[in-house]
């Protein structure tokens, strides 16, 4: 997260760290007791590694009573996701068992009504991604509030030049932005999950290259079918 600040500890009990061989790889969001939603591209290079999900964490390194690492029983990338596009960049991870819920571990309601969030709406994005252009990784969860950007502006040639389909949304990126390592994490508007950080190699913090988020409402049928 660029231009953000440290989050209040455990105030986002839905927040997950998707880990590869014990190290943070991507963000994720607990959407059901046994399911974490993340980004499909996160697992592209994880073929031989051990994927796990950390829940109830604020610090990645310090012991915390609520922290628990879960093995992954099943990884379900969206069937239409492809390595070279940002489209359909969603992944559902089934935990080896139901998460132990409590004040620091709780699923987040996700948007089912397929309607765009109004431009200018302030949404919260959180993650353990890099916090500066030098690539410094934080130990504790960071967050930032970002205004939603209208899709027409996001589709301008100087922004994302037509790449933003109706299944994607954008948020402003003027020095405050999601960045590498935040992919798969939640964009939360009005206490509801609206978007998932896409995992392309986008430049961060440049206002002409807005953050791109997969709209979960557009994938309600797929999410429901996997969770069923």
């Amino acid at each position: 997260i660029l231009g953000g600040r440290e989050a209040e500890a455990h105030a986002r009990p839905y927040m997950a760290s998707v880990q590869l061989n014990g190290a943070h790889l991507c963000g994720g969001v607990l959407v059901a007791e046994q399911w974490v939603l993340s980004a499909a591209h996160c697992l592209e290079d994880a073929a031989d590694g051990k994927v796990q999900v950390l829940l109830g964490a604020h610090s990645l390194s310090q012991p915390e009573p609520s922290k628990r690492l879960y093995d992954v029983l099943r990884a379900v990338p969206h069937p239409d996701s492809q390595p070279d596009t940002i489209d359909h960049d969603l992944l559902l991870l089934q935990l080896s068992e139901k998460a132990t819920l409590g004040p620091a571990v709780r699923p987040l309601p996700w948007q089912r009504v397929d309607r765009d969030v109004a431009p200018g709406t302030l949404c919260d994005v959180a993650g353990w991604g890099i916090v500066n252009h030098a690539g410094r990784r934080p130990d504790s969860l960071q967050h930032v509030l970002l205004p939603v950007l209208d899709r027409a502006t996001c589709n301008r040639r100087t922004h994302h030049d037509g790449a933003i389909t109706e299944r994607l949304m954008c948020a402003e990126s003027n020095r405050r932005d999601s960045c590498k390592g935040d992919s798969g994490g939640p964009l939360v508007c009005g206490g509801v999950l609206e978007g998932v950080v896409t995992s392309g190699s986008r430049v961060c913090g440049n206002r002409k290259k807005p953050g791109i988020y997969t709209r979960v409402a557009s994938y309600a049928a797929w999410i429901d079918s996997v969770l069923a």
Epitope: A152, N155, G162
Partner: antibody, heavy 116, light 112 residues
Framework: EVQLVESGGGLVQPGGSLRLSCAAS????????MNWVRQAPGKGLEWIGD????????DYNADFKRRFTFSLDTSKSTAYLQMNSLRAEDTAVYYC?????????WGQGTLVTVSS | DIQLTQSPSSLSASVGDRVTITCRSS???????????LEWYQQKPGKAPNLLIY???NRFSGVPSRFSGSGSGTDFTLTISSLQPEDFATYYC?????????FGQGTKVEIK
């Protein structure tokens, strides 16, 4: 299939007004800026300006700012170009073109002839 | 405003020829985001322009590989490696980095 269809061109007297329409189909109208470009007979392409179909924000080439106005009817997925105080030198084919990707999608153009 | 000057204004060539059109801008067209929004369009008589090249050197989908773009800063080139009968048309460069966006005056490619 993305389609842009202009209409409203024709013969108009100097000092007169005309409103051109650009009807869009095959995509969600509010997802892309609409631009207007004109081409005088035997001449090059000239950008008039653009409009954001979500916010209604506009940007005009300074040469056209006083006499030309963009508007929208999102319920009809249509953009409009209102042209006032027309002069002989405004005689041209007028195009609408969607921005994103680049100017990949253009209308067929509509001819405006300003003559007495 | 940024002026784009194309050369030549017109040229005569034969099928199979290699054709090069240049476009010079009055100032740099590198955008503040680091990209260069230099595009090339092909226009045939009575028709709307068609996008060929975007961001200096990227071919738009469906554009034959004989079309290529290059350049940086203020000097840009469109090359047609082996001219085909359907390539006889007018070609325009365009800059989208700075408002107002502008087109070159065009280069007409005619049959020799």
């Amino acid at each position: 299939e993305v389609q842009l269809v202009e209409s409203g061109g024709g013969l108009v007297q100097p000092g007169g007004s005309l409103r051109l329409s650009c009807a869009a189909s095959g995509y969600i109208f509010t997802s892309y800026y609409m631009n207007w470009v004109r081409q005088a007979p035997g001449k090059g392409l000239e950008w008039i300006g653009d409009i954001n179909p979500v916010t209604g924000d506009t940007d005009y080439n300074a040469d056209f700012k006083r006499r030309f106005t963009f508007s929208l009817d999102t319920s009809k997925s249509t953009a409009y170009l209102q042209m006032n105080s027309l002069r002989a030198e405004d005689t041209a084919v007028y195009y609408c073109t969607r921005e994103g990707p680049s100017f990949a999608y253009w209308g067929q153009g509509t001819l405006v002839t300003v003559s007495s | 405003d940024i002026q784009l000057t194309q050369s030549p204004s017109s040229l005569s060539a034969s099928v199979g020829d290699r054709v090069t059109i240049t476009c010079r801008s009055s100032q740099t067209i590198v955008h503040s985001n680091g990209d260069t929004y230099l595009e090339w369009y092909q226009q045939k008589p009575g028709k709307a322009p068609n996008l060929l090249i975007y961001k200096v050197s990227n071919r738009f989908s469906g554009v034959p590989s004989r079309f290529s773009g290059s350049g940086s800063g203020t000097d840009f080139t469109l090359t047609i490696s082996s001219l085909q009968p359907e390539d006889f048309a007018t070609y325009y460069c365009f800059q989208g980095s700075h408002v107002p966006v502008t087109f070159g005056q065009g280069t007409k490619v005619e049959i020799k």
